[in-house]
């Protein structure tokens, strides 16, 4: 494998020419201007000081310019996501310049060596940008660096080294190992561009976190909590085939950031929204579905520029595949009394009925415990747009679904053999839609019957006062 890299990030490669033997110095970072959506097209290789390729490939000095930066690789060949991203950018921004930063010779190394090469690659990009800035009409403000994994930190270095400030850097699951907790000048950080937005899809609090856990941008978005991505479980990626390994799960979750970004480009009519929250647990409890004071934003390409004084962590749920958009609902259930609850938490399900569609039966995830004489908040989400909600069916699951719960029930029975039956009283459910920011209160169909017990269900209909709108802004999409 190529080892001798000079300070300029070049690799020596002896080429034997027909007439004379000579050593040609080949750049270890290449900039390929993708002029066409056609993958067969060779594009144009740009190099500092050479204006001809810019003319040959009709580089548009006044248009947006995207630099796509891949990450560490175990292969000498581009990974498939690159084609999808280039194609999506061409589809969405027809006049834009799309440049692939090919640093495979420096990335196809031991991970530690590739990490050490990120600075060199960042310098190369900065030099290219400095040279382009010398051209009339070229503006750094129109530059958008998109870096995946290790490439996100390369983008950070480029933004740090360039003369001036690039318009935007998008970090797609920035690499974690050797960057977690690092100094801001040694990783992607908010001061690397006018706007730095980040998608975190493979963060782990235990074991090795492939993606960085800490927030590193102006906005840091953690889809599905930033860890377990739907459709990436062993069962999903392996199907019935036994050939796969855990590597496929890692790739699926890590690469999900790229596909979420691609989705935002090609499915702009189905934007996904993320909501500001202090942590994943609070988001799972349904507490953070507000759009007040810039607390929500579109994810990916459509993200609105937010330059907060301090970093903003945002969360959302997604589908398992494109289009990734789901519809989030906050459900506030006031439990005003309960009887004989015992040790175990009830398992609740809701079904939402709307003007457009009805949801599947959705579990209410109890993050901590059901509180009595208190409002319990839950997050539920649907894959389809239900329209205006009409009614809700709340079901308390009967027979326990887990051995753990069965054991707890058995213990409960031993201590209270004549348990007269567990019961909860719920009068109303307040629902807030994350996507529309509309709030609605649902009351029990029969005001006299507010109790629910295991194996039973309770129906709620829209209360007479109907939709209540608070002065909360809806997360409208502002297309860049």
């Amino acid at each position: 494998s190529p080892v001798p890299f000079g300070p300029e990030g070049r690799l020596e490669d002896k080429l034997h020419k027909p007439k004379a033997t000579q050593t040609e110095v080949k750049p270890s970072v290449r900039f390929n201007l993708r002029t066409s959506k056609d993958p067969e097209h060779e594009g144009c290789y740009l190099s500092v000081g050479h204006s001809q390729p810019l003319e040959d490939c009709s580089f548009n000095m006044t248009a947006k310019t995207f630099f796509i930066i891949h990450g560490w690789t175990m292969s000498g060949i581009f990974e498939n996501w690159l084609h999808k991203l280039v194609s999506a950018l061409h589809t969405r921004e027809k006049d834009a310049n799309v440049v692939v930063v090919d640093w495979l010779p420096l990335a196809h190394q031991l991970y530690t060596d590739a990490v050490n090469n990120t600075r060199v690659v960042g310098h190369s990009i900065a030099r290219m940008l400095d040279w382009l800035q010398e051209k009339d009409d070229f503006s750094l403000g129109n530059v958008h660096l998109i870096g995946y994994s290790l490439g996100a930190h390369v983008a950070g270095y480029a933004g740090n080294f360039v003369k001036g400030t690039v318009g935007r850097i998008t970090g797609l699951d920035p690499a974690g190992p050797m960057f977690e907790g690092a100094d801001i000048h040694k990783r992607l950080s908010p001061d690397d561009a006018d706007f730095v937005d980040v998608l975190h899809t493979y963060t782990r609090s235990f074991g090795l976190s492939i993606g960085i856990q800490m927030p590193v941008g102006h906005i840091d978005i953690y889809p599905n909590g930033g860890d377990f991505q739907p459709g990436c479980g062993l069962n999903d990626v392996l199907g019935s085939i036994a050939y796969g390994t855990i590597t496929e799960v890692v790739k699926c979750e890590h690469e999900r950031a790229v596909h979420l970004f691609v989705d935002s480009l090609v499915n702009q009519d189905k934007p996904s929204f993320a909501f500001q929250c202090t942590d994943s647990n609070r988001f799972k409890k349904g507490i953070c579905l507000s759009c007040r004071k810039n607390r929500c934003n579109s994810i990916g390409y459509n993200a609105k520029k937010m330059r907060n004084k301090r970093n903003s962590k945002m969360y959302l749920k997604t589908r398992a595949g494109m289009p990734f958009r789901v519809y989030h609902y906050q459900m506030k259930i006031h439990v005003f009394s309960y009887k004989n609850m015992g040790e175990i938490e009830p398992t609740f399900y809701v079904t939402l009925y709307g003007t457009n569609a009805d949801s599947q039966t959705l579990p209410l995830e109890i993050v901590e415990r059901i509180e009595q004489n208190a409002t319990n908040t839950f997050l539920v989400y649907t894959e389809e747009d239900l329209g205006d909600l009409l009614k809700i069916q709340l079901t308390w699951e009967g027979a326990s679904q887990s051995w753990y719960n069965l054991w707890k029930e058995f213990r409960s029975y031993l201590s209270q053999p004549r348990n007269p039956g567990r019961e909860l009283n719920i009068r109303r459910i307040r629902v807030k839609s994350g996507e529309t920011q509309r709030k609605l209160t649902f009351c029990t169909e029969d005001p006299e019957n507010t109790s629910i017990s295991p194996g039973r269900e309770l129906w709620f209909r829209k209360c007479r006062d109907g939709w209540r709108m608070k002065n909360e802004t809806s997360p409208t999409v502002e297309l860049p």
Epitope: E40, E42, S75, K84, D236, G239
Partner: antibody, heavy 119, light 107 residues
Framework: QVQLVQSGAEVKKPGASVKVSCKAS????????MHWVRQAPGQRLEWMGG????????TYNEKFKDRVTITRDTSASTAYMELSSLRSEDTAVYYC????????????WGQGTTVTVSS | EIVMTQSPATLSVSPGERATLSCRAS??????LHWYQQKPGQAPRLLIK???QSISGIPARFSGSGSGTEFTLTISSLQSEDFAVYYC?????????FGQGTKLEIK
Amino acid sequence: QVQLVQSGAEVKKPGASVKVSCKASGYTFTDYTMHWVRQAPGQRLEWMGGINPYYGGTTYNEKFKDRVTITRDTSASTAYMELSSLRSEDTAVYYCAKGDYYGGSYNYWGQGTTVTVSS
Amino acid sequence: EIVMTQSPATLSVSPGERATLSCRASQDISNSLHWYQQKPGQAPRLLIKYASQSISGIPARFSGSGSGTEFTLTISSLQSEDFAVYYCQQSNSWPYTFGQGTKLEIK
């Protein structure tokens, strides 16, 4: 026009090695990946691996990883595929194929090299 | 490893008629699907790339569609030279894999 010309047919004994060459012309050899695909009689096509001729980085099918080596000589615009520890099941037609910029589809193929493994 | 399954194994169609060939992937491959034609004693020839992109020099009667796990190659009006074996190939993840082929024969 783009052309990929492969070396001639080979007959090998089990346990031996074979090295097939593929000379490219009509395009910049270092700008596109080169892949090797084989086809045993009556069987589906099987991707063996590929090389990035620009710097020599390779990717192999795990099935062949311990036995296949793909190399290139940029001065001769030629890619090579060497398969070792040959067995009768390796009897097949071996093709080189030029990848697109991303290495995903193969618009140009060599004429194929028949390798027969027989004792 | 992504397994590609083509159907039917053999398709008998009369010249001038329409032929529809199917290819299924064992998991989502987005649009990373390519179609090839192979005649006896010849190397495969690329017909369609990335599910639906046409190839210069390939007659317009060849078209591709699909995304995710289900893909289709359609030959709108069969010519005598179209009778051959057709393969699909995925490039979504390594190892790249091919289908077992569909033999298109004259009815």
